[in-house]
């Protein structure tokens, strides 16, 4: 008999589910890299850009060895939800300049949403708790200027690129441990 009604269905092959998540993450990483390059081309970045509201990078070379699947998936989902909100904010608030990249930003947001749904599904199949973010999402304030919003766009795409890069590495490493 299958699992009792109401309990999450544990996938017969979590590695296949993880493979699918890795593929989506890789695809999103490629989109982000391409859009970041377009941004640099259209709106040259003068140095590195930060945005206080962005999540801090969860993984580094030093932490790869100690990764655990529940922690990685939970943190990745929380961070990507934050990036999803930031991309949404960019599309609505950043001014006419970024409207020239509207199709690409719209596609990026849609793919981010798809990856978030995939991660949620993976977590439920692995019977992992669907953790909520540690603190409620801080409302994103209006950009001080068009130039400020372009700097924010550079920061968001740069941060998302790094996060996805580490996510691919982390998920591939975890797959070998399943």
């Amino acid at each position: 008999p299958g699992p009792p009604a109401g309990s999450p269905r544990v996938s017969s092959d979590p590695r296949a589910d993880l493979d699918s998540a890795v593929l989506l993450t890789r695809s999103l990483l490629a989109d982000t890299r391409q859009l970041a390059a377009q941004m640099r081309d259209k709106f040259p970045a003068d140095g590195d850009h930060n945005l206080d509201s962005l999540p801090t990078l969860a993984m580094s070379a030093g932490t790869l060895g100690s990764l655990q699947l529940p922690g990685v998936l939970t943190r990745l989902r929380v961070d990507l939800m934050s990036y999803f909100r930031h991309v949404q904010w960019l599309r609505r608030a950043a001014g006419p300049s970024l409207k020239t990249l509207e199709p690409e930003l719209g596609a990026l947001q849609a793919r981010l949403e798809r990856l978030l749904r995939r991660l949620q599904l993976l977590m439920s199949r692995l019977a992992l708790p669907q953790a909520a973010p540690d603190q409620p999402a801080v409302p994103l304030g209006p950009p001080a200027s068009a130039w400020g919003s372009i700097r924010a766009a550079h920061a968001i795409l740069g941060g998302l690129h790094l996060t996805l890069d580490w996510a691919v590495r982390g998920l591939l490493l975890l797959k070998t441990r399943l």
Epitope: R92, A93, S97, E102, A146, W147, S149
Partner: antibody
Framework: QVQLVESGGGVVQPGRSLRLSCAAS????????MHWVRQAPGKGLEWVAV????????FYADSVKGRFTISRDNSKNTLYLQMNSLRAEDTAVYYC??????????WGQGTLVTVSS | QSVLTQPPSASGTPGQRVTISCSGS????????VSWYQQLPGTAPKLLIY???LRPSGVPDRFSGSKSGTSASLAISGLRSEDEADYYC???????????FGGGTKLTVLG
């Protein structure tokens, strides 16, 4: 404090040209997208055009596309609107406005353009 | 005809609460932020509300903005005689690639 001062308005015959200027002060002009908005006598506000902070992205209202050109000179803190092939329906007060995103936080006092034969 | 639809006029007595509506579509209000402007007779417009519901510093908290779906509203409570003006809503329109305005609402303070 932020100041936007339009100039260049006047009476012009249909089919002729006119160039409006907007001198900006009190803020870092090169950090802001800038718009032109017009208002015909006794009518509502009508958006005309926008130019990005760096000058390479421009959008125009359908009613002026192909006739009006928006430009800026960040070294002179000045916004321009070159108006060609003017029509009677272009008669309006023209305002320049600063925008941090999609809202206009500062407006000039306006300059009146009258197209009449 | 304006892309955003506002009632041409509205009125109220001092102290009253008045609401001005602004109706649009998915390509403007539905997917972008709404701003509101007040234009006193013979003067340039002044920003009242931006980002749907934020007030710039200096604008009294009697003015408030809200948005639901493809419609937005400006509410003015504790109406005063100096609030008599034209009010305009505005948003970016993704289909037109430009800013769109409502036709404006002339607010009259009675008595």
């Amino acid at each position: 404090q932020v100041q936007l001062v339009e100039s260049g308005g006047g009476v012009v015959q249909p089919g002729r040209s006119l160039r409006l200027s907007c001198a900006a002060s009190g803020f870092t002009f090169s950090h802001y997208d800038m718009h032109w908005v017009r208002q015909a006598p006794g009518k509502g506000l009508e958006w005309v055009a926008v130019i990005s902070y760096h000058g390479s992205v421009k959008f125009y209202a359908d009613s002026v596309k192909g006739r009006f050109t928006i430009s800026r000179d960040n070294s002179k803190n000045t916004l321009y609107l070159q108006m060609n092939s003017l029509r009677a329906e272009d008669t309006a007060v023209y305002y320049c406005a600063r925008t941090p995103g999609f809202h206009f936080d500062y407006w000039g006092q306006g300059t009146l353009v009258t197209v009449s034969s | 005809q304006s892309v955003l639809t506002q009632p041409p006029s509205a009125s109220g007595t001092p102290g009253q609460r008045v609401t001005i509506s602004c109706s649009g579509s998915s390509s403007n209000i539905g997917s972008n932020y709404v701003s509101w402007y007040q234009q006193l007779p013979g003067t340039a417009p002044k920003l009242l509300i931006y980002y749907d519901d934020l007030r710039p510093s200096g604008v009294p908290d009697r003015f408030s903005g809200s948005k639901s779906g493809t419609s937005a509203s400006l509410a003015i409570s504790g109406l005063r005689s100096e609030d008599e003006a034209d009010y305009y809503c505005s948003a970016w329109d993704d289909s037109l690639s430009g800013v769109v305005f409502g036709g404006g609402t002339k607010l009259t303070v009675l008595g």
